[in-house]
């Protein structure tokens, strides 16, 4: 009877990008008073863990702590809620959460094609490159939940590169990029050195408000 109840939420604290051997806590929660949560991990081994729900202030939740992150635990996780002792009466699944292990390979370089200081409205492109033969690059922006990703272009001057067009500049931000290989999408390189992009000729240089929807990975977006 999957989907009897609406889906719970699944969060990662402090975040879904986890350094090797560091701790991450996965939290299932819902405003439905679930007695149990089932945490499911997709991967070579499909694993399901049954967690007891705790009820506080009209919310049910359960935490799963990974004390030392390894490559074997990276993957796509989903959470289900259960209101009875029957494991078959579960809610719809939470949105998938990709837990990625970072810091495994050498860091790529990140640069802004027109330099890190740009005029408001100017089109910004960030380039991520490495001598390592990464198949994919991931660009993250501080304060945003999702990364953009692009395949690495063919080897040029001994490097593999991806160019991220961010559109017209409005607000600055701090960016990082990571490299990964096709066969291990949940295993990323060390972070590039952070790149602070500043926008001049703009009355404000604030962060996006918390209510602003963050773009999904891979969609074109403006530089906020």
């Amino acid at each position: 009877h999957e989907g009897v109840h609406r889906k719970p939420s699944l969060l990662a604290h402090p975040g879904r990008l986890v350094k090797s051997e560091e701790t991450v806590i996965l939290q299932c929660w819902s405003d439905v008073m679930f007695e149990h949560f089932l945490l499911h991990r997709e991967g070579m081994f499909n694993d399901t863990l049954r967690l007891i729900g705790e009820h506080h202030d009209g919310v049910s939740k359960a935490n799963f702590s990974i004390s030392r992150m390894t490559q074997d635990l990276a993957g796509t996780y989903r959470c289900y809620g259960s209101v009875t002792h029957s494991p078959y009466q579960v809610s719809a699944p939470s949105d998938p959460l990709d837990i990625v292990i970072i810091g495994l390979y050498e860091k790529p370089s990140l640069s802004a094609q027109l330099g890190p200081t740009v005029l408001a409205g100017e089109n910004v492109t960030l380039s991520c490159s490495s001598r390592s033969s990464y198949d994919m690059y991931h660009l993250s922006r501080e304060g945003e939940a999702h990364e953009r990703r692009l395949p690495a272009g063919p080897k040029v001057n001994g490097t593999f590169q991806a160019d991220f067009p961010l559109g017209p500049a409005t607000h600055g931000g701090t960016y990082r990029c990571f490299g990964s290989f096709h066969d291990s999408p949940y295993e990323w390189s060390k972070s590039s050195d952070p790149l602070l992009v500043s926008v001049t000729g703009n009355p404000s240089n604030s962060w996006p408000s918390p209510t602003e929807p963050s773009s999904k990975t891979g969609n074109p977006r403006h530089l906020h």
């Epitope: 070579m44 694993d47 030392r68 074997d72």
Partner: antibody, heavy 117, light 111 residues
């Protein structure tokens, strides 16, 4: 340096069960998969199944489904493989191996199980 | 009968380059990466190559791996007498939902 130490050789009668242990030392036990791989005399390698201790859910090769049980005890950093309804073809060296990404960089020394009447 | 197919034997003289093939299908080698193991008599296998062509630390660069379609190969250049061993390929199989191995190749280094 992670080490996997397995229990000693066993001689079993057909129809009985055997339980082999694999104790890990020198690293995080819970966060790495432990697989069991067997090798019959003069034969190749055969994956039987595996478990990630922190989850506790075992995954089995179709061939062994219903006959093998893989468990893990986080408190003692030990994984177990129990094979039931033994027959002479189950005579083999049984290895535990750690990790799936990359696969099996660390192996136990192997446990010889002989099934004979 | 192994899911992955390897030649039962291979040989070469010291200094030579030898290759060992491993043939599979779309559900294993075709969609997943290939790993190679080296095994000496009476000892546990040792990971030699993972993710098609990656060497764990401590494995000499004389060993290299490659993959194309549903086949893979292990190449050993500058063959040495201590390379005489059994070699196994392995890959995850999406249909069987488990690891599958080749039958193994016995490498002989001729004097």
């Amino acid at each position: 340096q992670v080490q996997l130490v397995q229990s000693g050789a066993e001689v079993k009668k057909p129809g009985s069960s055997v339980k082999v242990s694999c104790k890990a030392s020198g690293g995080t036990f819970s966060s790495y998969a432990i697989s069991w791989v067997r090798q019959a005399p003069g034969q190749g390698l055969e994956w039987m199944g595996g478990i990630i201790p922190i989850f506790g859910t075992a995954n089995y090769a179709q061939k062994f489904q219903g006959r093998v049980t893989i468990t893990a005890d986080e408190s003692t950093s030990t994984a177990y493989m129990e094979l039931s309804s033994l027959r002479s073809e189950d005579t083999a060296v049984y290895y535990c191996a750690r990790g799936v990404r990359p696969p099996f960089p660390t192996w136990g020394q192997g446990t010889l199980v002989t099934v004979s009447s | 009968q192994s899911v992955l197919t390897q030649p039962p034997s291979a040989s070469g003289t010291p200094g030579q380059r030898v290759t060992i093939s491993c043939s599979g299908s779309s559900s294993n080698i075709g969609s997943n990466t290939v790993n190679w193991y080296q095994q000496f008599p009476g000892t546990a296998p040792k990971l030699l190559i993972y993710s098609n062509n990656q060497r764990p630390s401590g494995v000499p660069d004389r060993f290299s791996g490659s993959k194309s379609g549903t086949s893979a190969s292990l190449a050993i250049s500058g063959l040495q007498s201590e390379d005489e061993a059994d070699y196994y390929c392995a890959a995850w199989d999406d249909s069987l939902n488990g690891w599958v191995f080749g039958g193994g190749t016995k490498l002989t280094v001729l004097a």
